[in-house]
Amino acid sequence: AAMGSCSKEYRMLLGQLQKQTDLMQDTSRLLDPYIRIQGLDIPKLREHCRESPGAFPSEETLRGLGRRGFLQTLNATLGCVLHRLADLEQHLPKAQDLERSGLNIEDLEKLQMARPNVLGLRNNVYCMAQLLDNSDMTEPTKAGRGTPQPPTPTPTSDVFQRKLEGCSFLRGYHRFMHSVGRIFSKWGESPNRSRR
């Protein structure tokens, strides 16, 4: 749905959420370009790009929540993701630097699409919560009460270490979106609302 507007059609909204999570679990849209841009595309370096345990809720945890609790957790987690993506973007090379070093400008464009995509997903999460009559959900543009702080990177002056932390975060993000997608695919069909 467009930012700020909510579809009242359950299956269309769920379809949008399913589509968005399908795309966001695809590593070719975020992790892979990040690895290439940051010069980590070497087998020995890729080995160090492992997901940090506990950075994102597990699929088991998500499955244990009711629909409303799941949406609230997803909303809060996406808030953290937005903060972290903003931090990652600040440390990306500029377009002209990429061209000079022979790297693909499309990779940078993919990384820059990540935050708008997360905002779009978060808007639809908010819309779905509204559709489920969840009055506790904060609007996607505002900070939620009790929203956990984004996972803070280890303070370090080591540029290489920061790149690896970014890589680990993105790996966890894709895995988390895969879990979210699996849960949305299980939501299946609500009571038939089609005869409006």
């Epitope: 467009a2 930012m3 579809s7 269309m12 379809g15 589509k19 399908d22 795309l23 695919s185 069909e189």
Partner: antibody
Framework: QVQLVESGGGVVQPGRSLRLSCAAS????????VHWVRQAPGKGLEWVAV???????DYNAAFMSRLTISKDNSKNTLYLQMNSLRAEDTAVYYC??????????????WGRGTLVTVSS | EIVLTQSPATLSLSPGERATLSCSGS?????MYWYQQKPGQAPRLLIE???NLASGIPARFSGSGSGTDYTLTISNLEPEDFAVYYC?????????FGQGTKLEIK
């Protein structure tokens, strides 16, 4: 290979009814949503209705009161029952498949279509 | 409902040239889909999720855009590319199509 074949079109008088069929092969209607999309002669495409894998349905509000979409999973066949037909319902009616088991409202496989002509 | 307006209505080009087809929405949409239709045939999916090539579609086709403005580009026109092209959205109910752009041989 995945295929959709429509049938049941023809010439019908205004006010009468018609039932279109769409036989699916190469995939199961229990795994995918299938839509009806129509195209008036020389005009663009217009989404009509969908029946999802679990049997729930959605209709274009513009003419939903006169339409019923249904399916027979055992025959792997989709139907569109059209009542109180009008001249403006004259069109080629296509059935078209959603690309996966989720609620995706776009179409990766289309049938060849069946022409419905409403005329006295 | 979201109205999709395609431009131009007709585009006359020669094989080997580059075609740029536009689709503008009355409201913002998340993703755009593009179909090709030849006379007497069913539509065929070309582009899904704004920029992803559908299965079996040659790489000369590409899609881009966001918000209300989307573009289908055919980089090096082949004789078989001359057809009618439709954009489609499903970000808002009901799913809607543009009125089509006819790509004809100059």
């Amino acid at each position: 290979q995945v295929q959709l074949v429509e049938s049941g079109g023809g010439v019908v008088q205004p006010g009468r009814s018609l039932r279109l069929s769409c036989a699916a092969s190469g995939f199961s209607l229990t795994n995918y949503g299938v839509h009806w999309v129509r195209q008036a002669p020389g005009k663009g495409l217009e989404w009509v209705a969908v029946i999802w894998r679990g049997g729930s349905t959605d209709y274009n509000a513009a003419f939903m009161s006169r339409l019923t979409i249904s399916k027979d999973n055992s025959k792997n066949t989709l139907y569109l029952q059209m009542n109180s037909l009008r001249a403006e319902d004259t069109a080629v009616y296509y059935c078209a498949k959603s690309p996966n088991s989720n609620f995706y409202w776009y179409f990766d496989v289309w049938g060849r279509g069946t022409l419905v002509t409403v005329s006295s | 409902e979201i109205v999709l307006t395609q431009s131009p209505a007709t585009l006359s080009l020669s094989p080997g040239e580059r075609a740029t087809l536009s689709c503008s929405g009355s409201s913002s949409v998340s993703y755009m889909y593009w179909y090709q239709q030849k006379p007497g045939q069913a539509p065929r999916l070309l582009i899904e999720d704004t920029s992803n090539l559908a299965s079996g579609i040659p790489a000369r086709f590409s899609g881009s855009g966001s918000g209300t403005d989307y573009t289908l580009t055919i980089s090096n026109l082949e004789p078989e590319d001359f057809a009618v092209y439709y954009c489609q959205q499903w970000s808002s109910y009901p799913p809607t199509f543009g009125q089509g752009t006819k790509l004809e041989i100059k």
